[in-house]
């Protein structure tokens, strides 16, 4: 006695798809694949299939049901922080093929990394134009300020909203002043928060406000303290430079914005006797710290004149060194001073029209605004380095 | 933000045709679509089509397809549609709604078309 | 075109309760990487607001007590502890294909 196994029905590629090996009929053990174009994919259900492969069984059917080859969907594409979507090839579309268009919120952050462009694969990601499938990153534009120029010297000034949105008032312990670096990191002194080194939480971080006692103002908590490890507490101000990261990134406004970073060719802006200025809730003539954030305008004092004013007493020898700048008058009045440790000394660079950081409040003599002393700033330019390792690292 | 403002309420005979406008402000899309959909008194919500106004792309519910035609001013960012042939039944609410990402992300208030003899 | 069923049409609730509201779509709306779903809350006189994207996803600003689930064709929208500003009409709605589809709406009233 025997009989013969029933052949199995022909198998009917699905749209978008193609059967292989092609037979004339298939019998008893006999199998095909199902391969899908470019750009589509195996489901059963909704469910993705790696391949898929049918057995034919000894009753003339097949042991699993044939597929379905669907277009590839990317799926809705990650929000960006800071930024949104436009969706190019039609409205919500997110299937083989689809454009999309990722942009910045315009004027205070701009897209670093590509153009935004996206386009969905037949891998099923969202990619580029490079081949990047991460995100586009919008970063915030630094050194936007209401003001448009240095201008003459002056006296001490109250600064008018949008002035200076880099300014941050540091609190925790004692008063001092730092400058925003892109959203979430701010540049001070380290002799300004020393003591919080270990203790970041400690820091009270305010922006976005003129006044120093104004209750309306963005507060920012710290995660962590760099601090410059050439830096020497209570043995002279070399490398009184220091970092704080924050745990959250500020939103960026025309009152909170970042300082830019001095490009190579910043000192070309910082010769002696360019102007810099100076903004801080820090000692006024009158002695006490300013209500308003009040600013000045100095010019950069010649290395070594200012060297020279800081070689006698009391000051040790070696006092100024190359890792310092000097601002200020000869004949004295116009300074920074007590408060404002930590806050950046800005100037303007005329080739791209933002306001950069070219020195970090340090010390000067006993007395703010002597004759014949100057205010000695930290220069950042001497920094950039560790300030991007550090800001890369972490 | 974005503010959709649609004009006034509109009373039409049978036959006639409406056209009812959508003027987008605060507004600095370049790409993104502008909906249309529309609520009879007591009913759901039925979508009839969307425009880009960016490059004048239509799509439309085969439902309206013969009756609607969807314009769109970019010099003004208005969005204008104008459905034709008017019966009872199109006596509702028309809701312009612009989709930037996955969504119906802005409503404009509403323009009541009324349709009766 | 895609049909979009919900149920109840209506439902009577008090402060506090906890409620489902059910949607089914006459063909599957989901692809390997989403579902396409969406729900909405529509007050009288004014225009609808989105509450739940992608089928379970909560927009922006809305209330957590809110929350979406399923996929394929079967969909819930959840209200864990009812709120007298929830009182109003739930749509579910789809964007997998043209033409877009809604539901025909869940009334919530106050019992």
């Known amino acids: 006695y025997t009989s013969t196994a029933q052949p199995c029905p022909y198998p009917m590629a699905p749209p978008n798809g193609h059967v292989s090996p092609v037979q004339a009929k298939y019998i008893l053990k006999d199998s095909f694949s199902i391969f899908c174009e470019t750009g589509y994919e195996l489901l059963q259900g909704h469910l993705p299939l790696k391949s898929f492969t049918a057995v034919c069984q000894k009753d003339g059917s097949w042991d699993r049901p044939m597929p379905a080859c669907s277009i590839v969907d990317c799926g809705p594409p990650d929000d960006l922080p800071s930024g949104r979507v436009e969706y190019i090839t039609g409205p919500g579309v997110t299937t083989y093929k689809a454009v999309i268009q990722y942009s910045c919120e315009e004027t205070f952050y701009t897209m670093k990394v590509n153009d935004g462009k996206y386009v969905c694969e037949a891998d099923g990601f969202w990619t580029s134009s490079k081949g990047e499938k991460s995100l586009p990153v919008c970063e915030p534009v630094c050194g936007l300020s209401a003001r448009t120029t240095g201008g003459r010297i002056y006296g001490g000034q109250k600064a008018k909203p949008g002035d200076f949105p880099w300014q941050v008032l540091i609190l925790g312990g004692t008063t001092a002043a730092g400058a925003l670096l892109y959203d979430n990191w701010v540049l001070t002194a380290a002799h300004a928060v020393y003591e919080q080194k270990h203790d970041a939480s400690a820091l009270d971080i305010r922006m976005g406000t003129l006044k120093r006692l104004s209750p309306h103002y963005t507060q920012a908590w710290s995660e962590a303290v760099f601090i410059h490890e050439g830096y020497t507490h209570d043995a002279g101000f070399d490398n009184d430079i220091a970092l704080i990261k924050l745990n959250n990134k500020v939103v960026i406004n025309s009152n909170i914005t970042p300082i830019c970073l001095p490009r190579k060719e910043a000192e070309s802006f910082m010769r002696t006797d360019d102007i810099g200025t100076a903004s801080g809730w820090g000692l006024t003539q009158r002695g006490f710290l300013a209500r308003n954030l009040m600013y000045v305008d100095i010019p950069i004092v010649d290395h070594q004149k200012c060297t020279a004013a800081y070689e006698k007493p009391p000051y040790p020898r070696g006092s100024v060194t190359a890792n310092m700048l000097c601002a200020g008058l000869e004949s004295g009045g116009k300074d920074s001073c007590r408060g404002d440790s930590g806050g950046a000394l800005v100037f303007l660079d005329s080739e791209t029209e933002r306001w950069f950081v070219g020195g970090i409040v340090s010390w000067g003599s006993m007395n703010c605004g002597e004759a014949g002393q100057y205010g000695v700033y930290t220069k950042v330019i001497n920094y950039i380095p560790w300030i991007e390792n550090i800001i890369s690292d972490f | 933000q974005v503010q959709l403002v649609q004009s006034g309420a509109e009373v039409k005979k049978p036959g006639a045709s409406v056209k009812v406008s959508c003027k987008a402000s605060g507004n600095t899309f370049t790409n993104y679509w502008m909906h249309w959909i529309r609520q009879a008194p007591g009913q759901g919500l039925e979508w009839m089509g969307y425009?880009?106004?960016?490059?004048?792309?239509?799509d439309f519910n085969q439902k309206f397809k013969d009756r609607v035609t969807l314009t769109a001013d970019k010099s003004t960012s208005t969005a204008y549609m104008e459905l034709s042939s008017l019966r009872s039944e199109d006596t509702a609410v028309y809701y312009c709604?612009?989709?930037?990402?996955?969504?119906?992300?802005?409503w404009g208030q509403g323009t009541t078309v009324t349709v009766s003899s | 075109d895609i049909q979009m069923t919900q149920s109840p049409s209506s439902l009577s609730a008090s402060v506090g309760d906890r409620v489902t509201i059910t949607c089914r779509a006459s063909q599957s709306v989901s692809s390997s990487r989403s579902t396409y779903i969406h729900w909405y809350q529509q007050k009288p006189g004014k225009a609808p607001k989105l509450l739940i994207y992608y089928s379970s996803n909560l927009e922006s600003g809305v209330p957590s007590r809110f929350s979406g689930s399923g996929s394929g064709t079967d969909f819930t929208l959840t209200i864990s502890s009812l709120q007298p500003e929830d009182f109003a009409t739930y749509y579910c709605?789809?964007?997998?294909?043209?033409?877009?589809?809604f539901g025909q709406g869940t009334k919530l009233e106050i019992k």
């Open positions: 425009i880009n106004p960016n490059t004048g792309y239509t």
């Open positions: 709605h789809q964007s997998w294909e043209i033409p877009y589809t």
């Open positions: 709604t612009l989709q930037l990402g996955r969504n119906f992300d802005y």
